[in-house]
Interface confidence: low
């Protein structure tokens, strides 16, 4: 469940974040899953752990495998898995599907292409951008911070875009490339008042004390790129990150899915080791966009285990 796919090219830097999040003060231990061997933290090693990050400087094909990270706090441990695959560099220009990051869509109004995973690296501007392996030239293309802006987007701008940058670690430089597809939307998008698909309003969810529980907040907002759209969970009117209960976590990130062409977002609330006091809380799934806010409230109730003696 708390597993993340990561990939890179041999002889490039690859930095992987532990899929389990914790406060900066928590310690994170990394292991190579197949051998249960601890990953060193000394920076002189080619592969080393640095808190929530696992660094391959540079990566080798033999590094491929599953890595375990354990986030340790005084009161709990959380385990995550990073499934790392390092590929050989392609001799031709074609970027295979397995090296592609998520596709982004653009329109005349909004044509930003973000460089995937760049936030994990210690890089300095400018980024280099390539389309179908050709360096981008001309005033229509502007490399701005961690993204590329294309002015006056046309359908011909669709294609595979690669960003290239340098990661610096203790004075040593390592190259990183990342590729994603860019599609151009012809049809006009629209936005609707948020529609929450789950949970139902005033839903009662049965949970077992001591077990884990998941609540999904899912809402759709219209068609095409949505601005100012978000789904989130609140506990007793407080944002999860402010509530301060480490057992209750919002799944990191929001997935923008397109079912029947609609732009939808999901946010999963994970409650570990359900306790009696969790039943007293009010769980609000909030969906917001530029039309307004919709709120669905969920309460938890105890699922009575079947008494086999009665």
């Amino acid at each position: 469940k708390f597993s993340k796919q990561s990939w890179g090219l041999e002889n490039e830097a690859l930095i992987v974040r532990c899929p389990r999040q914790g406060k900066p003060s928590y310690t994170v231990d990394w292991y190579y899953s197949q051998t249960n061997k601890s990953i060193p933290t000394q920076e002189r090693n080619r592969v080393f752990a640095s808190g929530q990050l696992l660094k391959f400087l540079p990566a080798a094909v033999a590094d491929s495998g599953i890595y375990t990270c354990i986030v340790r706090s005084p009161t709990f441990n959380r385990t995550g898995y990073a499934n790392v695959t390092i590929y050989k560099k392609q001799s031709d220009c074609n970027v295979p599907d397995y090296l592609m990051y998520s596709t982004v869509s653009g329109s005349e109004k909004n044509s930003k292409i973000y460089c995937p995973t760049i936030d994990l690296y210690n890089w300095t501007a400018p980024l280099e951008w390539f389309k179908n392996c050709q360096a981008l030239q001309g005033s229509r293309y502007r490399a701005h911070k961690s993204f590329l802006v294309i002015d006056n987007v046309m359908t011909e701008d669709a294609g595979d875009y690669t960003c290239k940058f340098i990661h610096n670690e203790n004075g040593a430089n390592y190259s990183v490339t990342a590729t994603r597809s860019f599609t151009v939307k012809d049809e006009q998008g629209f936005s609707l008042f948020p529609v929450i698909g789950a949970p139902a309003q005033n839903e009662i969810k049965e949970v077992e004390i001591g077990k884990n529980a998941n609540l999904t907040c899912s809402a759709c907002f219209g068609k095409g790129t949505q601005f100012l759209a978000a789904v989130l969970w609140q506990l007793n009117g407080t944002k999860i990150t402010d509530f301060g209960e480490p057992r209750i976590q919002q799944e990191e990130g929001q997935n923008q899915s397109f079912s029947n062409g609609l732009a939808c977002l999901d946010m999963v609330l994970r409650i570990a080791d359900v306790k009696e006091e969790d039943l007293l809380l009010q769980y609000d799934c909030l969906a917001l966009n530029l039309h307004g806010l919709r709120r669905h409230t969920v309460r938890l109730s105890r699922k009575n285990p079947i008494d086999h003696h009665s």
Partner: antibody
């Protein structure tokens, strides 16, 4: 402890512009929507608009459309509200407030006086 | 835009009194209604969100009820520090709109 600290009072002439800042501290800046609300002397509260600090997208009340611009600077965790073509009826205390449907943290307010 | 009508616009009451303020929306807003308290020279303070949920740190003498178009804020036993202006606000639709306010004064 979450705090929203606004810039100081301003006196402006009719037709001028004013830019009010609101610096957030104590939590992840981009995780919260920021609203701007104003209150004319002795009057009620009036919502002006909202900005998503994460992407910078905005939604403005129709009344202020074309006159108001809300921006943010993620490097300093600051949001800005600029109101142009000021008139005497824009004299008010301007508040930034954080939240989604309900705003549970407010700045201390910035008094903007428009007078010739 | 959704109009919010608050009543009364002002009221006089004594410490210990039960006080009720009503707010009506021009169209259904589900439970997306919030109540704020404001004292002179200060920023508003959130009391109740989602019509009936008490904001953390707010005394339990404050309560909210209602759904759809009609909402009520009740102060079960008025305290000296409760003399202030109270505003309702709909959080259902942009633009967000506030009621005109209710000033609670000492009798």
């Amino acid at each position: 402890q979450v705090q929203l600290v606004q810039s100081g009072a301003e006196v402006k002439k009719p037709g001028a512009s004013v830019k009010v800042s609101c610096k957030a501290s104590g939590n992840t800046f981009t995780a919260y929507y920021m609203h701007w609300v104003r209150q004319a002397p002795g009057q009620g509260l009036e919502w002006m608009g909202i900005i998503n600090p994460s992407g910078g997208s905005t939604s403005y009340a129709q009344k202020f459309q074309g006159r108001v611009t809300m921006t943010r600077d993620t490097s300093t965790s600051t949001v800005y509200m600029e109101l142009s073509s000021l008139r005497s009826e824009d004299t008010a205390v301007y508040y930034c407030a954080r939240g989604v449907g309900a705003t549970n943290y407010w700045g201390q307010g910035t008094l903007v006086t428009v007078s010739s | 835009d959704i109009q919010m009508t608050q009543s009364p616009s002002s009221l006089s009451a004594s410490v210990g009194d039960r006080v009720t303020i009503t707010c009506r929306a021009s169209q259904g807003i589900s439970n997306n209604l919030n109540w704020y308290q404001q004292k002179p020279g200060k920023a508003p303070k959130l009391l109740i969100y989602a019509a009936s949920s008490l904001q953390s740190g707010v005394p339990s003498r404050f309560s909210g009820s209602g759904s759809g178009t009609d909402f009520t804020l009740t102060i079960s036993s008025l305290q000296p520090e409760d003399f202030a202006t109270y505003y309702c606000q709909q959080g259902f639709n942009f633009p967000l709109t506030f009621g005109g306010g209710t000033k609670v004064e000492i009798k």
